[in-house]
Interface confidence: low
Amino acid sequence: MNGSEYFVKIQSFLGGAPTEDLKALSQQNVSMDLATFMKLRTDAVLPLTVAEVQKLLGPHVEGLKAEERHRPVRDWILRQRQDDLDTLGLGLQGGIPNGYLVLDLSMQEALSGTPCLLGP
């Protein structure tokens, strides 16, 4: 069974998938469509790297621009380094500026909804 066929079989269960499952899927050439991606749990999507999302979505990564103001894409963008977002070539804006450090202060992030940044 190839990646696309496997994805079709598990598609209906993906809404509640944890980050670990999404990371594993990104290695299996599944080409997740954007409608499915948009239904994923925000907390599961946030830890994914730009490279992992690119592999997870395949050709559909080019549709992220259309969803950049909607969750979970909006929140995921806020967690990525702008340099990394730029590699997608989609004009996605709102990433962490170059030279900033991201502090994993989970409590503050839970309260504010955004990561804590330290300037350069």
């Epitope: 050709p59 549709g63 997608l88």
Partner: antibody
Framework: QVQLQQPGTELVKPGASVKLSCKAS????????MHWVKQRPGQGLEWIGG????????NYNEKFRTKATLTVDKSSTTADMQLSSLTSEDSAVYYC?????????????WGQGTLVTVSG | DIVMTQSQKFMSTSGGDRVSVTCKAS??????VAWYQQKPGQSPKALIY???YRYSGVPDRFTGSGSGTDFILTISNVQSEDLAEYFC?????????FGGGTKLEIK
């Protein structure tokens, strides 16, 4: 409005190379990958590959990996495709088309195409 | 690679008729299919995306349907300007692939 300007014809000799251009206007050039499609006379469409206008990254159809080289010039909002070691099999119309533009998947806009004729 | 098969190379119809152009994918592509119309000497024109959504400006007599592996482009009340070749395309996975095309002829 979106416009994609391509030269009408190119006449080249077997074994030579040719560089085709696609001048884009009417949208933010760096926001959408530019793709290239081949159509031989009286035949169907073949996807050659796409290029990321932000950083020049490419994604090729394996069939064309050694035949085509895709590049971009952000300053002139132009995408180029160089075809090398030309044979009669390369005689075709070549189209450029941005993907996922206007938040819609697929190729909503196409250039007029460049007819390449390989003839000794 | 995913192969998109349009088994009918030619279809003949009369003005005002309803015609269905079919396309079959070699594996499940969900609804990640687009349809294009190409008139002689012109660039392809996008008609349908995501299997069933019309691009803006496309007449509502063009309707797309299907999911998984089987897709249909239906043209109702065929007009003389619909004389063209129609291609399906999948964008579910790389490489992006097109069907071989179906030429619509008006009787």
């Amino acid at each position: 409005q979106v416009q994609l300007q391509q030269p009408g014809t190119e006449l080249v000799k077997p074994g030579a190379s040719v560089k085709l251009s696609c001048k884009a206007s009417g949208y933010t050039f760096t926001t959408f990958w530019m793709h290239w499609v081949k159509q031989r006379p009286g035949q169907g469409l073949e996807w050659i590959g796409g290029v990321n206008p932000t950083n020049g990254g490419t994604n090729y159809n394996e069939k064309f990996r050694t035949k085509a080289t895709l590049t971009v010039d952000k300053s002139s909002t132009t995408a180029d495709m160089q075809l090398s070691s030309l044979t009669s099999e390369d005689s075709a119309v070549y189209y450029c088309a941005p993907h996922y533009i206007s938040s819609r998947p697929g190729f909503a806009y196409w250039g007029q195409g460049t007819l390449v004729t390989v003839s000794g | 690679d995913i192969v998109m098969t349009q088994s009918q190379k030619f279809m003949s119809t009369s003005g005002g008729d309803r015609v269905s152009v079919t396309c079959k994918a070699s594996q499940n592509v969900g609804t990640n299919v687009a349809w294009y119309q190409q008139k002689p000497g012109q660039s392809p024109k996008a008609l349908i995306y995501s299997a069933s959504y019309r691009y803006s400006g496309v007449p509502d007599r063009f309707t797309g349907s299907g999911s998984g592996t089987d897709f249909i482009l239906t043209i109702s009340n065929v007009q003389s300007e619909d004389l063209a070749e129609y291609f399906c395309q999948q964008y579910n996975s790389y490489p992006l692939t097109f069907g071989g095309g179906t030429k619509l002829e008006i009787k």
